[in-house]
C-alpha cells in the first residue's frame, strides 16, 4: 500500500486559556528527511490553513513567528499546540503530513480532531 496513514485524536478540549494540544502521528512509507506538517480547519465544506511548518528529520519544528501554532517533533510523531482559541474556533482540525524529500512524495491526511473551545466566564465583580 502506497498510502500514508496519519493518526490524531478524535476529540480535544481546549484549556480555559484557549490552548489546545494534540499529537499527530504518521506511518512513513519511506525514509523522509524533510517533512511538512499543516493544520487545516474544516468548516462545512470549506478548508482553510491554520498553520504550517517544514522540518528536517531530527530537527525541531519551526512555525512562522506570527503563527498561532507551536510544536515539537520526535520521529514520526508531531506534538502540536494551537493557541489563542475562542469559542467561535470550535471545529474540526485536520493534520496534513507531506513527505517532501527524498522522492517519492507522499501525502497523509488525518481524520481530524474536533477541538471544543469554551470561552471563560468573566470574573464577577467583587463586593469587598
Amino acid at each position: 500500500c502506497k498510502a500514508m496513514h496519519v493518526a490524531q485524536p478524535a476529540v480535544v478540549l481546549a484549556s480555559s486559556r484557549g490552548i489546545a494540544s494534540f499529537v499527530c502521528e504518521y506511518a512513513s512509507p519511506g525514509k523522509a528527511t524533510e517533512v511538512r506538517v499543516t493544520v487545516l480547519r474544516q468548516a462545512d465544506s470549506q478548508v482553510t490553513e491554520v498553520c504550517a511548518a517544514t522540518y528536517m528529520m531530527g530537527n525541531e519544528l519551526t512555525f512562522l513567528d506570527d503563527s498561532i501554532c507551536t510544536g515539537t517533533s520526535s520521529g514520526n510523531q508531531v506534538n502540536l499546540t494551537i493557541q489563542g482559541l475562542r469559542a467561535m474556533d470550535t471545529g474540526l482540525y485536520i493534520c496534513k503530513v507531506e513527505l517532501m524529500y527524498p522522492p517519492p512524495y507522499y501525502l497523509g491526511i488525518g481524520n481530524g480532531t474536533q477541538i471544543y473551545v469554551i470561552d471563560p466566564e468573566p470574573c464577577p465583580d467583587s463586593d469587598f
Epitope: A3, V47, I109
Partner: antibody, heavy 118, light 108 residues
C-alpha cells in the same frame, strides 16, 4: 476571483523550446503546491510536473524528465514550465492546476495549446 | 507507479438513468487520496469528488463516490443533459500523480 490563467503556448519545431506561464489570482499562492498536467489531442490527462510551496522540491513525469523545468515566483503569483528539446509527442493542451489543501487538483486553468511540428 | 484502470471506456446512457463508473488501482490507494474529475469538450477538467466520497464545492448530490483499497466507483444517480462528458479518476497520495484513461458518458 479565484483563477489560474496560462499563456505561452504556440507552434514550435522539434528540438525547440517554449516557456509556459500560469498567473494565479484570488488566493494565497504560496500556500499551495502547483502542478502542470497535459492532454494530447483526443487523449486523456497526463500529469507532467509538481512544485512545492517554496519551490525547493520538484517532481517530473519520466516522459519529460531532463527536458522540462518547473519553477514558481511567489512574489509574482506565477508558475512556469520551461520546455526544452521538444518532441512531436509533447503536442498537447497544457493546464496548470492547484494542489488543494486536501490534495486533489481543485482549481485548473483554461489551458494553453503547444504544438510541436516541423 | 500506481496504474488506474477505468471501465467501461464508453458508457451509453439515457437522460434520467443511473450511470456507474469504475476505477481500479494496481495497488491499494487510501480512500483519502482518490478523486474524480469531469471534463467537457474544449474545457478544463473540474473536480467532482475527493477523498473517494466527498463532493467538491458546488457539485450536485446526484454525484456520489464510493470504494476503498483498489476499487472505486463514481455514480451519477439521474443523468442530466449537462452530465454527458468524460470522467477521470486520479490518485494523489504519492508521486507520480496518476489518472485513469477516462470513461466517456454519452447519450444513448
Amino acid at each position: 476571483e479565484v483563477q489560474l490563467v496560462e499563456s505561452g503556448g504556440g507552434l514550435v519545431k522539434p528540438g525547440g523550446s517554449l516557456r509556459l506561464s500560469c498567473a494565479a489570482s484570488g488566493f494565497t499562492f504560496s500556500s499551495y503546491t502547483m502542478h502542470w498536467v497535459r492532454q494530447a489531442p483526443g487523449k486523456g490527462l497526463e500529469w507532467v510536473s509538481f512544485i512545492s510551496y517554496d519551490g525547493n522540491h520538484k517532481y517530473y513525469a519520466d516522459s519529460v524528465k531532463g527536458r522540462f523545468t518547473i519553477s514558481r515566483d511567489n512574489a509574482k503569483n506565477s508558475l512556469y514550465l520551461q520546455m526544452n528539446s521538444l518532441r512531436a509527442e509533447d503536442t498537447a493542451v497544457y493546464y496548470c492546476a492547484r494542489g488543494g489543501h486536501l490534495g486533489p487538483f481543485d482549481l485548473w486553468g483554461q489551458g494553453t495549446m503547444v504544438t510541436v511540428s516541423s | 507507479e500506481i496504474v488506474l484502470t477505468q471501465s467501461p471506456g464508453t458508457l451509453s446512457v439515457s437522460p434520467g438513468e443511473r450511470a456507474t463508473l469504475s476505477c481500479r488501482a494496481s495497488q491499494s490507494v487510501g480512500s483519502s487520496y482518490l478523486a474524480w474529475y469531469q471534463q467537457k469538450p474544449g474545457q478544463a477538467p473540474r473536480l467532482l469528488i475527493y477523498g473517494a466520497f466527498s463532493r467538491a464545492t458546488g457539485i450536485p448530490d446526484r454525484f456520489s463516490g464510493s470504494g476503498s483499497g483498489t476499487d472505486f466507483t463514481l455514480t451519477i444517480s439521474r443523468l442530466e443533459p449537462e452530465d454527458f462528458a468524460v470522467y477521470y479518476c486520479q490518485q494523489y497520495g504519492s508521486s507520480p500523480w496518476t489518472f485513469g484513461q477516462g470513461t466517456k458518458v454519452e447519450i444513448k
